[in-house]
């Protein structure tokens, strides 16, 4: 009953004469254990005897040991691990047929058939290619041989056009119940040049002898392979010549379908054959040419051919590194004149005149100057001729105003308070002068550009400078205005004494002034409107109080005179001219009030008074006023006073006071 038995093996085993076979086999029986195992060669069932007959190659015993007999057949399995693997070594052609595995358990019997195919000669391996080979796309080539046996070593080797392939192949061997094979896998990137080439897989024995082989021709799909040819074979041609370029398709798989031509990467219109002819070439036809050919794989582009059309230099133009250029800077001139071949000689012109010794494409002036301004042009020359001189390029050289000077427009001399007009002049400037600057800065009027009007000029306006300005300012040397003015800073200064003036001192006063233009001056001293002297000093040998007062000095020059502020001369002296006065007269009736006043002339004023009677007896009064109230007859007599200041003392003459009796007193008597 087949449902009770499960036996696994490859089904058919292939080998060749003298090789060996290895039959991987496993079994499983549902009902009990395997008791007997017999290997038949081409078994046939005898109906009469109800048993299988045929050549017995192997028979198991009760103890499971191998019997003596067929040495080339080996049962490699055992009942314990359900293995029924066997090998035949060597194997012969007449071993072809069926191998019958008769299996008997306590209750069940089964015959399993395995096909054995032994050929006379080693059979070839089979090369398996992917459905499509395309250049540079990596694929795996497989060489398969339905054979493998542990007792017989083989090797698969790859060849391309009979030459062993350098790429490393991976060999896989399978000896499983599912399949028995040897397979070699080779990773391979076909190139277009492999198209049509033969790939061989050789089967080698252990000694390296070739036993068999399989061959395939490669069909590598690739884009067209191109070369380009030029006739005449020079790619440097002269303007007006004709040139033919041919695109050769060296290989294409599949056949090419379209052709086009490109110049500098841009397709040429209506050029779709393998030949491109350029008649009477022009300069503009110089460039890099190539052809593009497409097939179903894709487009291919040939290498580029650089076509150089030679021509004489064209009309030149001059490129200037900077214009306007600032004076003193570096300026580079470049002569641009398309030509092929490049010009070998250049001639430079400045304002139409040849610049000697300059024969290169670039002309440099390291420090540009105003006279370098103008039109620069050039001529270029190559083997085909001299180019036309272009119109030239203008160089503008900018510089600060030159030779700036200042002129005083006034008639001289200039007096303080005059209106002075100054003009600022220059010789040249680029760009034009657009403003002026003046030093020192003042609230001055600029009636027109470059003219300065100073109204009411100050005595101290000594020097003025102007600058003419464009992008830069250039300063003129300062002009001294030489303003004439009356003496300034006139003042009275006491030279001696150094301290305060006391009556009798020697006194000197100086008339000072700070400045005068012109320098020549005269002096005048004045007191209360009276002229005192004409020297710079006023001297008093012995000063008296009468000399005190308000003094002024005057200094004059040819422009005018200046007075000092009034200066007060103060003379200090002891009290003098003392006298006693009586407001009510010198005769007073008793009982009334008698007031005596001590009057004095003193500088500084009297600070202390003393009173004395006719006996020079000091009275107990210290004020300026002596008040007797009520006055008595016995107060009659002579009185005097004394005044004191910090300079000294002075006293008055005697004055007599007469006190007479009142009518009441007389009446009483």
């Amino acid at each position: 009953d087949s449902s009770k038995w499960n036996i696994e093996h490859p089904g058919t085993i292939y080998a060749w004469e003298g090789a060996c076979v290895w039959v991987p086999c496993t079994y499983r029986v549902l009902d009990g254990a395997l008791e007997t195992f017999i290997l038949f060669h081409n078994p046939e069932y005898n109906q009469n005897m109800s048993k299988f007959e045929g050549t017995r190659l192997y028979e198991s015993t009760k103890d499971g040991k191998l019997p003596s007999g067929q040495k080339r057949v080996q049962f490699l399995g055992n009942k314990i691990n359900n293995n029924c693997t066997l090998s035949i070594h060597p194997v012969h052609v007449n071993d072809s047929g069926q191998l019958g595995l008769r299996m008997v358990s306590k209750t069940e019997k089964w015959m399993e058939r395995i096909h054995l195919n032994v050929s006379e000669r080693p059979f070839p391996p089979r090369i398996q290619l992917p459905p499509k080979l395309q250049e540079s796309q990596e694929v795996t080539l497989t060489c398969l041989l339905n054979f493998s046996c542990y007792g017989y070593q083989i090797q698969l080797q790859w060849l391309l056009e009979g030459v062993p392939m350098r790429q490393a192949a991976v060999t896989l061997t399978s000896l499983s119940t599912k399949s028995v094979f040897t397979r070699s896998e080779l990773k391979f990137s076909p190139q277009w040049s492999h198209h049509g080439k033969i790939v061989t897989c050789e089967l080698h024995d252990v000694d390296g002898k070739v036993l068999s082989e399989d061959m395939v021709q490669l069909n590598v799909k690739h884009t067209p392979k191109l070369t380009i040819e030029v006739t005449p074979n020079e790619t440097t041609v002269r303007k007006g010549d004709s040139v033919t370029m041919t695109c050769k398709v060296n290989s294409s798989n599949p056949e090419y379908t379209t052709v086009s031509w490109l110049k500098d990467g841009i397709p040429l219109k209506e050029q779709n054959t393998l030949m491109l002819t350029l008649h009477k070439v022009t300069k503009s036809q110089s460039g890099r040419y190539c052809c593009r050919v497409s097939n179903d794989v894709g487009p291919a582009t040939s290498e580029k051919v650089f076509l150089q059309v030679q021509y004489a230099p064209e009309s030149s133009r001059v490129q200037i590194s900077q214009s306007p250029a600032v004076e003193g800077s570096e300026v580079n001139f470049l002569c641009i004149s398309p030509a092929n071949p490049l010009p070998t000689n250049y001639t430079w012109y400045h304002n139409g005149k040849e610049v000697q010794g300059r024969t290169e494409k670039q002309f440099q002036i390291q420090k540009i100057l105003p006279w370098h301004a103008g039109t620069y042009s050039c001529e270029a020359e190559n083997i085909l001729g001299i180019g036309e001189r272009g119109p030239g390029t203008e160089l503008d050289v900018q510089y600060p105003p030159k030779k700036v000077t200042m002129v005083i427009e006034n008639p001289t001399p200039i007096r303080e308070g005059d209106t002075v007009t100054l003009s600022c002049n220059y010789s040249s400037s680029n760009p034009i002068v657009n403003h002026y600057e003046w030093r020192p800065r003042g609230a001055w009027e600029e009636p027109s550009l470059g003219v300065l009007k100073i109204q009411n000029i100050g005595w101290n306006n000594t020097a003025v400078a102007c600058a003419a300005c464009n992008n830069w300012c250039s300063w003129a040397s300062p002009v001294t205005l030489n303003v004439l003015y009356a003496p300034r800073g006139v003042r009275v200064r006491k030279i001696k004494p150094l301290s305060e003036i006391h009556s009798g001192n020697s006194v000197s006063l100086q008339c000072d002034f700070s400045s005068s233009h012109p320098k020549e001056v005269q002096f005048f001293w004045e007191k209360n409107g009276s002229l005192l002297g004409k020297e710079s000093q006023l001297n008093f040998d012995s000063i008296s109080p009468e000399d005190a007062g308000s003094y002024s000095c005057w200094v004059n020059n040819s422009i005018g005179q200046t007075a000092s502020k009034a200066w007060t001369l103060e003379v200090l002296y002891a009290p003098r001219r003392l006298r006693v006065s009586m407001s009510q007269g010198n005769q007073v009736m008793e009982g009334k009030t008698a007031t005596l006043i001590c009057e004095s002339d003193a500088n500084p004023p009297v600070y202390s008074y003393a009173w004395f009677d006719w006996n020079n007896q000091s009275l107990p009064y210290s004020g300026r006023m002596l008040r007797l109230e009520p006055v008595k007859v016995q107060h009659s007599g002579a009185y005097w006073c004394q005044g004191t200041n910090r300079v000294g003392k002075g006293h008055s003459p005697l004055i007599t006071l007469t006190v007479y009796y009142s009518p009441q007193t007389i009446g009483r008597r």
């Epitope: 004076e327 003193g328 610049v355 000697q356 010794g357 300059r358 290169e360 440099q364 002036i365 390291q366 420090k367 100057l369 105003p370 006279w371 370098h372 510089y399 030159k402």
Partner: antibody, heavy 124, light 110 residues
Framework: QVTLKESGPGILQPSQTLSLTCSFS??????????VGWIRQPSGKGLEWLAH???????YYNPALKSRLTISKDTSKNQVFLKIANVDTADTATYYC????????????????WGTGTTVTVSA | QAVVTQESALTTSPGETVTLTCRSS?????????ANWVQEKPDHLFTGLIG???NRAPGVPARFSGSLIGDKAALTITGAQTEDEAIYFC?????????FGSGTKVTVLG
């Protein structure tokens, strides 16, 4: 007539600063295209360019000596000065000043007029 | 720093043509080197002859001419005269400084 005259200390000691004056006449350094340069010549040897200054205050120095050199001008006094700091005996030479000019109508400069030189000795 | 090389001495005869050269250690001399030629006569009398490779200074005799010959600057005296006996220095400009050559002593055999 263009003339240039160099003046200097004659003799000085190592590590001192050499001060040279070039007094010129016949041209002005306020004029476009004018410059003055200093060149020296050790006894029996060749010329060595030191520095030059242009009318527009552009200054150029010998790179090997740049850290020690200072060139300046006083346009109003028609003088150009050169200072060489930290002198050594190797600075012993005759020092020349020369006008460098770009004459009218020319595009390049010339060392056209030279002074007669001043001898400087650096000695310990 | 560059080195500027000149012939140490040249001898010529009156009326002959003599060419002095000036080589730069940094490569070919170009117009960008603004070659200057200076003449030194006895008693340290220096005169500028040529500027900007090939321009004669004002007042310099026409027999003096400057040029580039190959990779060198050159000074040619066409029809040398006895008064041309002197030392000739070339100076080359290197973008921001001059370097003088060692000088060529020219002898004009009378």
């Amino acid at each position: 007539q263009v003339t240039l005259k160099e003046s200097g200390p004659g003799i000085l000691q190592p590590s001192q600063t050499l001060s040279l004056t070039c007094s010129f006449s016949g041209f002005s350094l306020s004029t476009s295209g004018m410059g003055v340069g200093w060149i020296r010549q050790p006894s029996g040897k060749g010329l060595e360019w030191l520095a030059h200054i242009w009318w527009d205050d552009d200054e150029y120095y010998n790179p090997a000596l740049k850290s020690r050199l200072t060139i300046s001008k006083d346009t109003s006094k028609n003088q150009v000065f050169l200072k060489i700091a930290n002198v050594d005996t190797a600075d012993t030479a005759t020092y020349y000043c020369a006008r460098i000019s770009i004459p009218y109508g020319y595009y390049d400069w010339f060392f056209d007029v030279w002074g007669t030189g001043t001898t400087v000795t650096v000695s310990a | 720093q560059a080195v500027v090389t000149q012939e140490s001495a040249l001898t010529t005869s009156p009326g002959e043509t003599v060419t002095l050269t000036c080589r730069s250690s940094t490569g070919a001399v170009t117009t960008r080197n603004y070659a200057n030629w200076v003449q030194e006569k006895p008693d340290h009398l220096f005169t500028g002859l040529i500027g900007g490779t090939n321009n004669r200074a004002p007042g310099v005799p026409a027999r003096f001419s400057g040029s580039l010959i190959g990779d060198k600057a050159a000074l040619t005296i066409t029809g040398a005269q006895t008064e041309d006996e002197a030392i000739y220095f070339c100076a080359l400009w290197y973008s921001n400084h001059f370097i003088f050559g060692s000088g060529t002593k020219v002898t004009v055999l009378g």
